[in-house]
Structures are given as structure tokens and as C-alpha cells.
């Protein structure tokens, strides 16, 4: 079994026309069809429901060996209208050239203005040679390049001009642009295409760091800052986006920062969000692309509606240990925001030295450690205090 | 933020060289994005551009014509900053200079520019 | 060397009124590379305006930006105490020109 692949009625590879006029192409097959064409919206237009601007699509009469037949019809086409116009089969997933579908690159002429392209931006990188996409809405144009310092000509072979995708040039000739845009002449009056930002990328981001890193837990009315930083090769581009519960409804912005370094770039987004409530509670996500690689990064956010310290024992209020131990450990389960002043006391008295709300550390255990030893917690601004007291029985052995 | 702080002389002499240096914080004039430029006005000729520097792999400068015999704008990496050099004043360069920076995210318009800086030629 | 020029040099208006800048080019230009700024006494310009209509980070919406090939228009809708200032349109293309101002005060 061999598919028969559509055919048109415009035999041409391509076909030229002019502003104002209509157009007509015919399309048979041996399967249900579609058409793809440059102003098409997302779902065609059908039927009788005539739009001037996207076009219609038809039934038509087939044939025996191809029954299936689509129209495609369009109105006082426009340059907007150049590009190509395939007619494929609906059904079958693969859209292949002389298998599935056929086509016919259109060009509509407008010599008030042959360029189509909008402006947009150019990612540069270090591959040999790139397309710099300004479309023509006439054929066989003698076309340059231009930057803002300097003029490409067409030679073959460091630049190559094609009347459907533009210009093809060595990216070495790209990297001091700032911007691009394609001139030509036509009769006496010179045009430019609308003008391509260049953006100069590095190939590789390194690394990807969100901070604060795992979670970042803050009172309703404070304020939210996390920092995105991306390590990249240097004088590379990157784009940031963010997900969090709160981006639909445009909550916080975005600022983006960039750091070059001699080795590397480093290049940040820091997201804020100001007067957080219960509604900005979830993960937030911070993506970083260079149309190359995607690196993400995700944190918790923990909003609490008050001030709050919640202390209870970890292994019950009376620890055991073994005189001559060296290293004991008395844990509590703490749960506090924001952190709380702490002190630990033995037998009422404080203890000096540095410790941890979460545990107290003994080292050297002796029979002398046996004792009651207490946690104060306290957050004087909230009005809060929290004690809990563990035994300990030190045994000797 | 991004911030542009000029320093430099008030009055220089004619046929001397006028030097003024623009310190950046918030961006670095190393970055891919961005370009460093000098403007001056002064009654007589408005809002002038002067020329720019911008490093794409490499550092490159453009100049405005009625300048480019005589002016120099450098770069300088380690204090992040860029320089204005005009050689041979005279009279007709009294004005108020300014540094500023055009970003891609805007067409490199101008979008963050130094306070100003009134360089009067006289003897 | 583009010339913009711009009209009128001076425009007399009161709080609350539409105020209308007109900017021409010498020769077309591309929409991306215009903008404009609003200077006031003693300070330098501030962007307003790029690529003809995209108004900058943090520039109310009453100012509006149009226009394409030599013929560009700045306009404020309704006049606050703070819009009273001396306006420039630029060209950013190729070389890079000013136009001469226009000046916004009150009537």
C-alpha cells in the first residue's frame, strides 16, 4: 500500500501575485484534508461564514482516484498573506512533503512595501550560521543587511539570500550587532524590513540557585524577596520566568539583575512581593531558559497569620544516659516563627555557651549531669513564652 | 536599580581635553544588553548624541560625525565605569553632558541617564 | 543624518486638557527606534516612550505614543500639574538625532 499524496491546482512551487487580488487553490486527495496557510487563525474558518481576513475553506468536487477535495479561498490577499500554503491529510499525524501533503509558497507583492516581517528578537549563539527571518512579499529582490555600523552583501557563502526565509549568514559576522534589518531597492525608493533586536547568547548556563533554598516562611504583611541567579557562560543571555500561587492575579514583580564576571555571567530575576497574606502561600518556581537549556529551581513558601512558638518533647521528659558517654543529646520538637530568644537552664541555673533551641549537646557525660534541664522560649515584641523542662538520670555503670 | 553617577571637571580651557567618567551600579557595562552613552545639550545645539560603547564579544564604539575626529569613549571593566574624552575644546562645547544607558528591552532608548554634568570652555 | 523636527515649539494648555506632540522624520524611520522623553528644569530627560507606542517601567498610562515612517505623535490625555515639561522625541536607528523640543506649559 502506497499513499497517494495530495495535489493542487497550482502546479508552481511557488506562485506570485498581487495585492488586492484574490486567490484560489484546489486541493484533492485520497483522505480527509486540511489547509495551513499564513493568515490562517487557529481553527479555520468553514462553510459559508466568509471572513476577508483568514480566508475560507470549502468542499469541493473530487475525483475518482482522489475524492476528497478542499478550496481554499481568500479575498484582496495582502502582504501579510505571502508564505506557504499546504493542503494535508487530516488524519495522518506525519505532515510530509510529496507523502502526506502538498504545497505552494505564495508570494503576494506590495511594492509600497515588500518587507513582512515584525520586529522581533534574534537569539545568536555560537552555531556556524543562522537565518536572519526578514520575509519578502516579492521574489528576486536584491537584498542587504544591515546593522547599525555596518553593511552585509549576499556573497554565496558567508551570507546567502533567500527569497522565503531571509538571509543565512555566518553568526561571526552577528556578534558586535545591535540590530538587524534587511534593505533593498525597488524602482528608486529604498526600504528597510522592521528592524531584529540581537541578542548574543552563550551556549551553556552552569548552575541555577534559588534563594532563600528550601522553604521561607514569613508573617501575613511581610514582605516576600526571593533571588534567581543563574551562572552562565559569559556575556550569555537568559530568560526568567516564575510560577507561584499568585502570578495570575500579577502579585509582585520581577526585576531582573546581571553581573559579568572575567570567567562568567551571572544574571538574577528577584521577585517581591510586598504585604504577603494566606493566598501567597505555595511553591514558587523560578525558570531560566536560554533557548538552548531550561534550568528550574522551586521553594516553599509558609505564610503564618500570627506571631507563634510550639515546643514539645521529642523522646518524652525523661532521657537516659551512661556516665562517660561522650556527646548526649536532648532533643525538643520546636516549631516557632519568627525565630525566638532561647535559653537553656540546668537545675534553674543558665548555661553559658552557644546552643541550639533544637537540642542541647552535652559532652563528657558524668554523674554530675543529672539534674532537670529547662528551655525558655520567649518572643518579646509578640507577648509570647514557651518553657519545657526534660529529666535527665545519668546511670553509672 | 540601576544608577549612573558622572563625575568630572566643570571648566575646562580651550583647546585642553574635557574628561568625564560615569560609574554604573545596577548593571555592568560588560553586559550583552546594554549600550553606554554620552549626550550633551546646550541652547545653541539641544540634545546632542556623542557616541557609545557596548561589548559583543568585543568592545566596540560608535561616534556621532561631528565629533569623531576628537572624541574617545572608553570602557573600564574593573570599576565599572566608562569615560568621555573630547580633545581640543572650544567655546562651542560648553554644555551640560550626560552619561546614559540604552537597553535592548527598550530598542536602546535611553532609559536610565546620569544627573548632568556643566562643562563650561573658557580660559 | 535624520532630522526630526518638531511641532509646535511651544504649547499652551490648561490642567485637564489633551496635549498633542507632533514629531517628523527627514526620512522614514522604524517605529522601533523612536521614542520619547520629558525633560523638566534642572534634570535630565526621562523616558517616556519606546519603539513609537510602548509606554517605559513605571510611566503613567494617560501618556500615549503613534505613528509610523515620518510621522510620529506623543499625546497626554489629560494634563496634571507634573506633566508641564519640555518634550523630545529621538531616533535611534542609525545615528542617533534629537528633535528641537516642544515646550508644554501652563496657559
Known amino acids: 500500500y502506497s499513499m497517494t499524496p495530495p495535489t493542487l491546482n497550482i502546479t508552481e512551487e511557488s506562485h506570485v501575485i498581487d495585492t488586492g487580488d484574490s486567490l484560489s487553490i484546489s486541493c484533492r486527495g485520497q483522505h480527509p484534508l486540511e489547509w495551513a496557510w499564513p493568515g490562517a487563525q487557529e481553527a479555520p474558518a468553514t462553510g459559508d461564514k466568509d471572513s476577508e481576513d483568514t480566508g475560507v475553506v470549502r468542499d469541493c468536487e473530487g475525483t475518482d482516484a482522489r475524492p476528497y477535495c478542499k478550496v481554499l479561498l481568500l479575498h484582496e490577499v495582502h502582504a501579510n498573506d505571502t508564505g506557504s500554503y499546504v493542503c494535508y491529510y487530516k488524519y495522518i499525524k506525519a505532515r510530509i512533503e510529496g507523502t502526506t501533503a502538498a504545497s505552494s509558497y505564495v508570494f503576494v507583492r506590495d511594492f509600497e512595501q515588500p518587507f513582512i516581517n515584525k520586529p522581533d528578537t534574534l537569539l545568536v549563539n555560537r552555531k556556524d550560521a543562522m537565518w536572519v527571518p526578514c520575509l519578502v512579499s516579492i521574489p528576486g529582490l536584491n537584498v542587504t543587511l544591515r546593522s547599525q555600523s555596518s553593511v552585509l552583501w549576499p556573497d554565496g557563502q558567508e551570507v546567502v539570500w533567500d527569497d522565503r526565509r531571509g538571509m543565512l549568514v555566518s553568526t561571526p559576522l552577528l556578534h558586535d550587532a545591535l540590530y538587524l534589518q534587511c534593505e533593498t531597492t525597488w524602482g528608486d525608493q529604498d526600504f528597510l524590513s522592521n528592524p531584529f533586536l540581537v541578542h548574543i547568547t552563550g551556549n551553556e548556563l552552569y548552575d541555577i540557585q534559588l534563594l532563600p533554598r528550601k522553604s521561607l516562611e514569613l508573617l501575613v504583611g511581610e514582605k516576600l524577596v526571593l533571588n534567581c541567579t543563574v551562572w552562565a557562560e559569559f556575556n550569555s543571555g537568559v530568560t526568567f520566568d516564575w510560577d507561584y500561587p499568585g502570578k495570575q492575579a500579577e502579585r509582585g514583580k520581577w526585576v531582573p539583575e546581571r553581573r559579568s564576571q572575567q570567567t562568567h555571567t551571572e544574571l538574577s530575576s528577584i521577585l517581591t512581593i510586598h504585604n504577603v497574606s494566606q493566598h501567597d502561600l505555595g511553591s514558587y518556581v523560578c525558570k531560566a531558559n536560554n533557548g538552548i537549556q531550561r534550568f528550574r529551581e522551586s521553594t516553599e513558601v509558609i505564610v503564618h497569620e500570627n506571631p507563634f512558638i510550639s515546643v514539645e518533647w521529642l523522646k518524652g521528659p525523661i532521657l537516659e544516659a551512661t556516665a562517660g558517654d561522650e556527646l548526649v543529646k536532648l532533643p525538643v520538637k520546636l516549631a516557632a516563627y519568627p525565630p525566638p530568644e532561647f535559653q537553656w537552664y540546668k537545675d534553674g541555673k543558665a548555661l553559658s555557651g552557644r546552643h541550639s533551641p533544637h537540642a542541647l549537646v552535652l559532652k563528657e557525660v558524668t554523674e554530675a549531669s543529672t539534674g532537670t534541664y529547662t528551655l525558655a522560649l520567649w518572643n518579646s515584641a509578640a507577648g509570647l513564652r514557651r518553657n519545657i523542662s526534660l529529666e535527665l538520670v545519668v546511670n553509672v555503670p | 536599580q540601576v544608577q549612573l553617577q558622572q563625575s568630572g571637571p566643570g571648566l575646562v580651557k580651550p583647546s585642553q581635553t574635557l574628561s568625564l567618567t560615569c560609574a554604573i551600579s545596577g548593571d555592568s557595562v560588560s553586559g550583552n544588553s546594554a549600550t553606554w552613552n554620552w549626550i550633551r545639550q546646550s541652547p545653541s545645539r539641544g540634545l546632542e548624541w556623542l557616541g557609545r560603547?557596548?561589548?559583543?564579544?568585543?568592545?566596540?564604539?560608535d561616534y556621532a560625525e561631528s565629533v569623531k575626529s576628537r572624541i574617545t569613549i572608553n570602557p573600564d571593566t574593573s570599576k565599572n565605569q566608562f569615560s568621555l574624552q573630547l580633545n581640543s575644546v572650544t567655546p562651542e562645547d560648553t554644555a551640560v553632558y550626560y552619561c546614559a544607558r540604552g537597553d535592548s528591552s527598550s530598542w536602546y532608548a535611553f532609559d536610565y541617564w546620569g544627573q548632568g554634568t556643566l562643562v563650561t570652555v573658557s580660559s | 543624518e535624520i532630522v526630526l523636527t518638531q511641532s509646535p515649539g511651544t504649547l499652551s494648555l490648561s490642567l485637564g486638557e489633551r496635549a498633542t506632540l507632533s514629531c517628523r522624520a527627514s526620512q522614514s524611520i522604524s517605529s522601533s527606534f523612536l521614542a520619547w522623553y520629558q525633560q523638566k528644569p534642572g534634570q535630565a530627560p526621562k523616558l517616556l516612550i519606546y519603539?513609537?507606542?510602548t509606554r517605559a517601567t513605571g510611566i503613567p498610562d494617560r501618556f500615549s505614543g503613534s505613528g509610523s515612517g515620518t510621522d510620529f505623535t506623543l499625546t497626554i490625555s489629560r494634563l496634571e500639574p507634573e506633566d508641564f515639561a519640555v518634550y523630545y522625541c529621538?531616533?535611534?536607528?542609525?545615528?542617533?538625532?534629537f528633535g528641537g523640543g516642544t515646550k508644554v506649559e501652563v496657559k
Open positions: 519603539a513609537a507606542s
Open positions: 529621538q531616533q535611534y536607528g542609525r545615528s542617533l538625532s
Open positions: 560603547t557596548y561589548y559583543r564579544s568585543k568592545w566596540n564604539h
